[in-house]
């Protein structure tokens, strides 16, 4: 079988509040009921895990309480939101999708979404 295809936008600009959202869509070769989604950040060949969630098809994604990610799922599409981003967090955010159950296991890795984060300029002190 070929690698499971995972599609995500090439570029996203975070909001001034440090929030970035993007869609991760996967072409499921079978009828998965349990899916694991992991967001990885790649910068200068270093890869770190940003967040991960396992969900049952038709149910909400559940990230850990202290996670900077939230998300919703609809069919083979996951809508991901990452918050608390700062300029230093600019990088390539890669969506990794694993079809955990039922067997066989499938793994797909997206080509990444380049998220640009610009720290807002501080408001100048008013003289009034």
């Amino acid at each position: 079988c070929k690698a499971m295809h995972v599609a995500q936008p090439a570029v996203v600009l975070a909001s001034s509040r440090g929030i970035a959202s993007f869609v991760c869509e996967y072409a499921s070769p079978g009828k998965a009921t349990e899916v694991r989604v992991t967001v990885l950040r790649q910068a200068d060949s270093q890869v770190t895990e940003v967040c991960a969630a396992t969900y049952m098809m038709g149910n909400e994604l559940t990230f850990l309480d202290d996670s900077i990610c939230t998300g919703t799922s609809s069919g083979n599409q996951v809508n991901l939101t990452i918050q608390g981003l700062r300029a230093m967090d600019t990088g390539l955010y890669i969506c990794k999708v694993e079809l955990m159950y039922p067997p066989p296991y499938y793994l797909g890795i997206g080509n990444g979404t380049q998220i640009y984060v610009i720290d807002p300029e501080p408001c100048p002190d008013s003289d009034f």
């Epitope: 070929k2 890869v47 890669i94 296991y105 793994l107 890795i109 990444g112």
Partner: nanobody
Framework: EVQLVESGGGLVQPGGSLRLSCAAS????????IGWFRQDPEKEREMVSC????????KYADSVKGRFTISRDNSKNTVYLQMNSLRAEDTAVYYC???????????????????WGQGTRVTVSS
């Protein structure tokens, strides 16, 4: 369905050699990373060595550099790990892993692996 089948493990004396083989099937992409990882009961799974299918970029753990050599035979969809000058600390279960990556992905990063073989045990002891 992706299948990775390892062979070549066994018992060897310190200073000896072994060659591990991993035969991959059920995966038709031209681009992937494939490599060897090891794990013993007290530690997490660690990458030993890895090779990229296209271009042949390789990566080695510091602890095996100069002793282990990874190679591949694309016509047989097989990857090999030649292990020389084996030490007691090389004792572990060795797993073959595959990562279905593309050129944008960092070479041989453990986060991208997900397909695993059943493992082959290597014991280095006198």
């Amino acid at each position: 369905e992706v299948q990775l089948v390892e062979s070549g493990g066994g018992l060897v004396q310190p200073g000896g050699s072994l060659r591990l083989s991993c035969a991959a099937s059920g995966f038709s992409s031209d681009y992937y990373d494939i490599g060897w990882f090891r794990q013993d009961p007290e530690k997490e799974r660690e990458m030993v060595s890895c090779i990229r299918s296209s271009g042949g970029s390789t990566k080695y753990a510091d602890s095996v550099k100069g002793r282990f050599t990874i190679s591949r035979d694309n016509s047989k969809n097989t990857v090999y790990l030649q292990m020389n000058s084996l030490r007691a600390e090389d004792t572990a279960v060795y797993y073959c892993g595959l990562a279905p990556i593309s050129p944008v992905h960092a070479v041989c990063n453990q986060h991208y692996f997900g397909y695993w073989g059943q493992g082959t045990r290597v014991t280095v002891s006198s």
